[in-house]
């Protein structure tokens, strides 16, 4: 069920996930000058049952110069606080992936972890793309990719995103759309999003305390 490959590389773009399907693994990577403690886990694993998903294992880094005398321990989520509002799900907002069964939230940071996280995704995972600073998006479709199983092999769908330098002219006149906008897609392709019109991540996330569906606070 693990995806054979990483999500597609789009020039001048990065991808991110909103939540992680059960079975996803996160490498325990440490920043330069630090390493995993000898008995430490190689990875964290998203596991769960029908009602709750969480990350197994802890990532722990220690200074490469020491011999495990000072262990930096992963901050543990003691309690997940959910702040629910009475607002109805907006048609402009996707169903919150992390509130669906079988998905884990973003693991909390740990001391001296590497800046970039390396995930190993499973079939059904969706990631969203965004052009990096200094580039703008030209779309012909969704700026997202899903790992699918086809004829016994896994593959990632191709995100319809081209990132062009700010000063360059549009390759597809009239085709420019807001960046990283999870757009409408057939039900058969994913049940994680409601059908939407074009909209920006800014409105899609509804991320303030006042408008969010819930916020998880890692203790």
């Amino acid at each position: 069920e693990l995806c054979d490959d990483d999500p597609p590389e789009i020039p001048h773009a990065t991808f991110k996930a909103m939540a992680y399907k059960e079975g996803t693994m996160l490498n325990c990577e440490c920043k330069r000058g630090f390493r995993r403690i000898k008995s430490g886990s190689l990875y964290m694993l998203c596991t769960g049952n029908s009602s709750h998903s969480s990350w197994d294992n802890q990532c722990q880094c220690t200074s490469s110069a020491t011999r495990n005398t000072t262990k930096q321990v992963t901050p543990q989520p003691e309690e997940q606080k959910e702040r629910k509002t009475t607002e109805m799900q907006s048609p402009m907002q996707p169903v919150d992936q992390a509130s669906l069964p079988g998905h884990c939230r973003e693991p909390p940071p740990w001391e001296n972890e590497a800046t970039e996280r390396i995930y190993h995704f499973v079939v059904g995972q969706m990631v969203y793309y965004q052009c990096v600073q200094g580039y703008r998006a030209l779309h012909r479709g969704p700026a997202e990719s899903v790992c699918k199983m086809t004829h016994g092999k896994t593959r990632w769908t191709q995100p319809q995103l081209i990132c062009t330098g700010e000063m360059e002219t549009s390759q597809f006149p009239g085709e420019e759309k807001p960046q990283a906008s999870p757009e409408g897609r057939p039900e058969s392709e994913t049940s994680c999003l409601v059908t939407t019109t074009d909209f920006q991540i800014q409105t899609e996330m509804a991320a303030t305390m006042e408008t969010s569906i819930f916020t998880t606070e890692y203790q």
Epitope: T14, K16, D96, E113, T115, I201, T215, T216, Y218
Partner: nanobody
Framework: QVQLQESGGGLVQAGDSLRLSCAAS????????MGWFRQAPGKEREFVAT????????YYADSVRGRFTISKDNAKDTLFLQMNSLRPDDTGVYYC??????????????????WGQGTQVTVSS
């Protein structure tokens, strides 16, 4: 060009509240994790709180957990820090920071590539 501008600092009594804001521009705010750091007089800058790109997951320094709340409004390109039950040891300059393109959290200074100028918070006893 990326700009981060903090506001909302001031002089308050112990036990009071303050709400800091950080107005962001020059980048796609909704795509980045953000964080708050602070620097007390004569001390190094330290982590206070961080929030993921979606605005749904948060993490706090032990010293502020339960008293401070970080949030972000992706529609208004603004980061917030609600500070309740302030204590004298919360005094310092508070900075907002933008996480690097591929960083999940703005947890360490290494995770961040842009910083605001800071806003002074002074808590008197």
């Amino acid at each position: 060009q990326v700009q981060l501008q903090e506001s909302g600092g001031g002089l308050v009594q112990a036990g009071d509240s303050l709400r800091l804001s950080c107005a962001a521009s020059g980048f796609n705010f909704g795509w980045h994790a953000m964080g708050w750091f602070r620097q007390a007089p004569g001390k190094e800058r330290e982590f206070v709180a961080t929030i993921t790109w979606t605005g749904r997951d948060t993490y706090y320094a032990d010293s502020v957990r339960g008293r401070f709340t970080i949030s972000k409004d992706n529609a208004k390109d603004t980061l917030f820090l609600q500070m309740n039950s302030l204590r004298p040891d919360d005094t310092g300059v508070y900075y907002c920071a933008k996480a690097r393109e591929r960083a999940t959290w703005a947890y360490s200074e290494d995770d961040c590539d842009y910083w605001g100028q800071g806003t002074q918070v002074t808590v008197s006893s």
